[in-house]
C-alpha cells in the first residue's frame, strides 16, 4: 500500500538566462528509493539511480546540472523551458510517486515593466 | 481561441465507474499539452492527469494513479478521463484544460460535476 506523498516546489517562476532548482521530497514512507526520473511533458531531462548515480540525457547535459540531492538545476533558461516538469519516484515495495512542478520562464523585461509603474 | 466544453459528470456509487469526455474547438487540437484538474468544495484546485501533444506520455497525481487513466482522440480533438474505482474523495469539479508547449495552461473547461457517494 502506497502511504507516501510527494512535496515540491509547485508553480514557480524565474527569468531568462537565470537558473531554478526544482525539487521534490518524498515522505511519510519507509519505502528504499531505488531511481528517480526527471522529465518534461516530452522527454526524459535526467536519472538518478540508486546504484549507477546521475544520468543527464545528451540534449540537456549543458544546462542542468544533478542535486541538490534527489533535485535538479536548470541553467540558462529560455522562454521555451516553460512547462511541466514531473518527478518520478521508484520506490519499493510501494511502486512510483509522481510529484508535478510546473515552471513559467519570464522575459527579463517582465520584472523592469512592473518596477515602472510602482508608485514611490 | 480553443474552447473546451467537458461531459460525463454525474452521481455514481463508490467503486463505480465514469467517463469525462473534453471536446476541443478552435485550435490545432494535437498542438496542445491538455491536463484535468478537479477542485472540491473549499479546497484548492488540483491537478489530476497530463498527456503530451503526442499522446506518448501521461502523468497522474498519485492519488488516483491506477485507477484514473488519460487519453486523447485527435480525430475527434477530445481529451477523455476515464475513472474507476471511484471513492468519495473523488468528488469534486473536474476541469479540462489546455495549453501550449511552453505556456501556462490558459484554455480552461466550464467544468463538469463528480459526486462519489458512500
Known amino acids: 500500500m502506497m502511504t507516501g506523498t510527494i512535496e515540491t516546489t509547485g508553480n514557480i517562476s524565474a527569468e531568462k538566462g537565470g537558473s531554478i532548482i526544482l525539487q521534490c521530497h518524498l515522505s511519510s514512507t519507509t519505502a528504499q528509493v531505488t531511481q528517480v526520473n526527471w522529465e518534461q511533458q516530452d522527454q526524459l531531462l535526467a536519472i538518478c539511480n540508486a546504484d549507477l548515480g546521475w544520468h543527464i540525457s545528451p540534449s540537456f547535459k549543458d544546462r542542468v546540472a544533478p542535486g541538490p540531492g534527489l533535485g535538479l538545476t536548470l541553467q540558462s533558461l529560455t522562454v521555451n523551458d516553460t512547462g511541466e516538469y514531473f518527478c518520478i519516484y521508484h520506490t519499493y515495495p510501494d511502486g512510483t510517486y509522481t510529484g508535478r512542478i510546473f515552471l513559467e520562464v519570464l522575459e527579463s523585461s517582465v520584472a523592469e515593466h512592473g518596477a515602472r509603474f510602482q508608485i514611490p | 481561441e480553443v474552447q473546451l466544453v467537458e461531459s460525463g459528470g454525474g452521481l455514481v456509487q463508490a467503486g463505480g465507474s465514469l467517463r469525462l469526455s473534453c471536446a476541443a474547438s478552435g485550435g490545432t487540437f494535437r498542438s496542445y499539452v491538455m491536463g484535468w484538474f478537479r477542485q472540491a468544495p473549499g479546497k484548492e484546485r488540483e491537478w489530476v492527469a497530463t498527456i503530451n501533444s503526442s499522446g506518448s506520455r501521461t502523468y497522474y497525481a498519485d492519488s488516483v494513479k491506477g485507477r484514473f487513466t488519460i487519453s486523447a482522440d485527435n480525430a475527434k480533438n477530445t481529451v477523455y478521463l476515464q475513472m474507476n474505482s471511484l471513492k468519495p474523495e473523488d468528488t469534486a469539479v473536474y476541469y479540462c484544460?489546455?495549453?501550449?508547449?511552453?505556456?501556462?495552461?490558459?484554455?480552461w473547461g466550464q467544468g463538469t460535476q463528480v459526486t462519489v457517494s458512500s
Open positions: 484544460a489546455a495549453r501550449p508547449n511552453y505556456r501556462d495552461y490558459e484554455y
